[in-house]
């Protein structure tokens, strides 16, 4: 068998809402993956599990099942959405995200994704993780790759 390549492309959009009573931020983050099947037979993308971390705390998880079948030597782009909540001990972020003196409220999130593929009864898992900028102050649609946070050695806390 040849490889199945998974490439995390980046954040496609982030839609924000607030609960003023709870001082809580809700971010629906849609991410894009490219999955390439380098084999001469079809493979099934069985599931995608994703989680988002802010400051080493998991703020959102998602799982998609029975997603698609990728034909031989084919590539498919898959979008998946992770609902995230910044609350409780991180409610200090509500101050930052709702401060109107700032126009771009970028926070650094760690996106983790695991893709499970199957072919001929064999299962394979491929994982990726990437730091991304997301604006927690307004709804944003990104050009693919625009939200990448390059300084992975020093993520903002």
């Amino acid at each position: 068998p040849r490889s199945i390549d998974v490439k995390y492309i980046g954040v496609k959009s982030a839609y924000v809402s607030y609960d003023v009573q709870k001082r809580t931020i809700y971010l629906n983050i849609t991410n894009t993956l490219n999955i390439t099947n380098n084999n001469y037979y079809s493979v099934e993308v069985e599931n995608i599990t994703a989680q988002v971390q802010f400051s080493k705390t998991v703020i959102g998880k998602a799982r998609l099942n029975n997603i698609t079948i990728i034909g031989p030597l084919d590539m498919k782009q898959i979008d998946y959405t992770v609902p995230t909540v910044i609350a409780e001990e991180m409610s200090y972020m509500y101050d930052f995200c709702t401060l109107i003196s700032i126009k771009v409220h970028n926070i650094v999130l760690m996106m983790q994704v695991t893709v499970t593929t199957t072919y001929f009864g064999h299962s394979e898992q491929i994982s990726q993780e990437r730091y991304q900028y997301v604006d927690c102050g307004r709804n944003t649609t990104y050009q693919l790759g625009q939200s990448e946070y390059l300084n992975v050695l020093q993520p903002q806390q």
């Epitope: 607030y18 003023v20 001082r23 409610s91 509500y94 101050d95 709702t98 003196s101 126009k103 102050g137």
Partner: antibody, heavy 119, light 111 residues
Framework: EVQLVESGGDLVKPGGSLRLSCAAS????????MSWIRQTPDKRLEWVAT????????VYPDSVKGRFTMSRDNVKNTLYLQMSSLKSEDTALYYC????????????WGLGTSVTVSA | DIVMTQAAFSNPVTLGTSASISCRSS???????????LFWYLQKPGQSPQLLIY???NLASGVPDRFSSSGSGTDFTLRISRVEAEDVGVYYC????????FGGGTKLEIK
């Protein structure tokens, strides 16, 4: 109904101090940033200070930086503006206003409290 | 600081006709995020300022649709399609691209 009621305005001498208050009601005070704006005798509006919803961040223009301090008490639903080293040019009607994080505007204003700095 | 410039008085208008009020900023208020941080406030006699327009062209809650606003990055116009007696007051443009600054205000005059 959103209500903002300022108080504490007075006649003070140059170099003196004064603390203004703004009592908020009709909305979840702890969920919104707040601002102070003043209107000079010639009717010009000048932004004075902004504080974030939890009081973590404050922002001031150079004209009042180091002399004015904005704070808030989210239990009492009250906003404060501590003014010191007052000058004659600080004479104005002082308004408090709510910052709206969707419109990025100051969407509700109080009726104001008058501060006069004069010898 | 960004300077906002307005004429002190509008051209006198007749009730029921349209009025335009202009404002100019010393720097473009269009942010790279696509939002123009230009606002209009109306101060009626004896009252505090009230929000009319946010982000250049959006009508604030409760504001009649007789009001509209348009502009480029630096030149802006507030239009009132059918002026009513209750529209009398001073109209301020403001920006918060870089902290808040206000124009000097334009007094709407009725013939």
């Amino acid at each position: 109904e959103v209500q903002l009621v300022e108080s504490g305005g007075d006649l003070v001498k140059p170099g003196g101090s004064l603390r203004l208050s703004c009592a908020a009601s009709g909305f979840t005070f702890s969920g919104y940033g707040m601002s102070w704006i003043r209107q000079t005798p010639d009717k010009r509006l000048e932004w004075v200070a902004t504080i974030s919803s939890g009081g973590r961040y404050t922002v001031y223009p150079d004209s009042v930086k180091g002399r004015f301090t904005m704070s808030r008490d989210n239990v009492k639903n009250t906003l404060y503006l501590q003014m010191s080293s007052l000058k004659s040019e600080d004479t104005a009607l002082y308004y408090c206003a709510r910052d709206n994080f969707y419109s990025y505007a100051m969407d509700y204003w109080g009726l104001g409290t008058s501060v006069t700095v004069s010898a | 600081d960004i300077v906002m410039t307005q004429a002190a008085f509008s051209n006198p208008v007749t009730l029921g006709t349209s009025a335009s009020i202009s404002c100019r900023s010393s720097k473009s208020l269009l942010h790279s995020n696509g939002i123009t941080y230009l606002f209009w406030y109306l101060q009626k006699p004896g009252q505090s300022p009230q929000l009319l327009i946010y982000q250049m062209s959006n009508l604030a809650s409760g504001v009649p649709d007789r009001f509209s606003s348009s502009g480029s990055g630096t030149d802006f116009t507030l239009r009132i399609s059918r002026v009513e007696a209750e529209d009398v007051g001073v109209y301020y443009c403001a920006q918060n691209l870089e902290l808040w600054t206000f124009g000097g205000g334009t007094k709407l005059e009725i013939k």
